[in-house]
């Protein structure tokens, strides 16, 4: 993974990091799929949204997610290069007013309706991984990533840099 040398070494800074601007630097509407090309889908059930990981039928339309990218500053003593220790953080919104949230107590990923400013649980540090894949690390729980478990999204603890390229925390973004 890019920028990793033992997850805990630098992710201590996540709790203290600050989003440097209230506006995203860019936004991107994309479909989200796993390393193994299963699609992440969102379904409204009993007035709440459920998140699924599934194989789509041929020609079935993929759900889109709005990714909003923010810059976040490492505290200078953590990054080792003063104000230049920038990270890229992202929020993920599959539908208006709903955002993916990390529920660290339940080790789950949920869709919550909320207003801006978004809570820290809605922010994930973006990691560029294994070739052209990305991973999402919880801002509120360093070393914990969005991953796939039993055909659902879950929070998965990653305890060493070697494990950062495990397929279940790798995702692909696509405009199609």
């Amino acid at each position: 993974a890019f920028g990793i040398s033992g997850v805990q070494k630098y992710t201590r800074a996540l709790h203290d990091s600050s989003i440097t601007g209230i506006s995203p630097i860019t936004e991107y509407l994309a479909s989200l799929s796993t390393y193994n090309d299963q699609s992440i889908t969102f379904a409204l059930e009993d007035e709440s949204y459920e998140i699924y990981v599934e194989d789509l039928k041929k020609d079935e339309k993929k759900d889109k997610v709005l990714l909003s990218y923010y810059e976040s500053q490492h505290p200078s003593n953590e990054s080792g290069d003063g104000v230049d220790g920038k990270m890229l953080m992202v929020t993920l919104s599959p539908t208006k007013d709903f955002w993916l949230h990390a529920n660290n107590k339940e080790h789950s990923v949920e869709l919550h309706k909320c207003e801006k400013p978004l809570p820290d649980q809605a922010f994930f540090v973006l990691h560029n991984m294994h070739s052209n894949c990305v991973s999402f690390e919880c801002k509120t729980d360093p070393g914990v990533f969005i991953g796939v478990k039993d055909n659902h999204l879950a929070l998965i603890k990653v305890d060493s840099s070697e494990n950062l390229c495990t397929e279940n925390i790798l995702f692909k973004l696509s405009e199609t």
Epitope: A1, F2, G3, I4, S5, K9, Y10, I25, T26, Y69, H74, S79, G80, D81, D84, G85, K86, M87, L88, V125, L126, H127, N128, M129, H130, S131, N132, E137, S161, E162, L164, C165, E175
Partner: antibody
Framework: EVQLVESGGGLVQPGGSLRLSCAAS????????MSWVRQAPGKGLEWVSA????????YYADSVKGRFTISRDNSKNSLYLQLNSLRAEDTAVYYC???????????????WGQGTLVTVSS | DIQMTQSPSSVSASIGDRVTITCRAS???SSWLAWYQQKPGKVPKL??????SLQSGFPSRFSGSGSGTDFTLTISSLQPEDFATYYC?????????VGQGTKVEIK
């Protein structure tokens, strides 16, 4: 202050080898992806290779794949590029460059070294 | 591989002119485009990243826009220190690729 200092360039015959080094200071090297970018005399920039912060992932331009090898030694704050089977068209200034973001390559190269010249000629 | 095509390859302009450089990607790269400024005999400098974010140290007369496949670098009022070669680079996917450059010259 971030500093990147390349060394190891020089004159080499076609088919020969060189090892370029980049000494990094002023930041935590292991937190950043690093790259080599080259520029032939009077020509444009060409990305050559990149390596992850841990060194576990490496990437190459098609023009150098199988001939060049990128590596790093974070304990020595150093980045390397091994150049084998050199050709005349590899003649260029080789720059090492550091990414803008600690966990992502999306931001491009924020810091560059001064470059080292590699000349491939018989 | 994603091809990056810059136009024009060179532009002659006067002090105070508005200069526009375009960069086109052969496939969508979201907003993951960087622009670099390089002066003769000097090292390239990151000017704009994520298509429109201005790197600290550069004045606000520089701006970037675009997403997907079409991108623009604009210098709103050209100054003497802006005469240089400008390159676009996609940082979306490997292999990373760079445009051929646009040289901004004094008219």
């Amino acid at each position: 202050e971030v500093q990147l200092v390349e060394s190891g360039g020089g004159l080499v015959q076609p088919g020969g080898s060189l090892r370029l080094s980049c000494a990094a200071s002023g930041f935590t090297l292991s937190s950043y992806a690093m790259s080599w970018v080259r520029q032939a005399p009077g020509k444009g920039l060409e990305w050559v290779s990149a390596i992850s912060g841990s060194g576990g992932s490496t990437y190459y331009a098609d023009s150098v794949k199988g001939r060049f090898t990128i590596s790093r030694d974070n304990s020595k704050n150093s980045l390397y590029l091994q150049l084998n089977s050199l050709r005349a068209e590899d003649t260029a200034v080789y720059y090492c460059a550091k990414t803008l973001y600690t966990t992502s390559w999306y931001g491009g190269f924020q810091h560059w070294g001064q470059g080292t010249l590699v000349t491939v000629s018989s | 591989d994603i091809q990056m095509t810059q136009s024009p390859s060179s532009v002659s302009a006067s002090i105070g002119d508005r200069v526009t450089i375009t960069c086109r990607a052969s496939q969508g790269i979201s907003s993951w485009l960087a622009w670099y400024q390089q002066k003769p005999g000097k090292v390239p400098k990151l000017l704009i990243y994520a298509a429109s974010s201005l790197q600290s140290g550069f004045p606000s007369r520089f701006s970037g826009s675009g997403s997907g496949t079409d991108f623009t670098l604009t210098i709103s009022s050209l100054q003497p220190e802006d005469f240089a070669t400008y390159y676009c680079q996609q940082t979306h996917s490997f292999p990373w690729t760079v445009g051929q450059g646009t040289k901004v010259e004094i008219k």
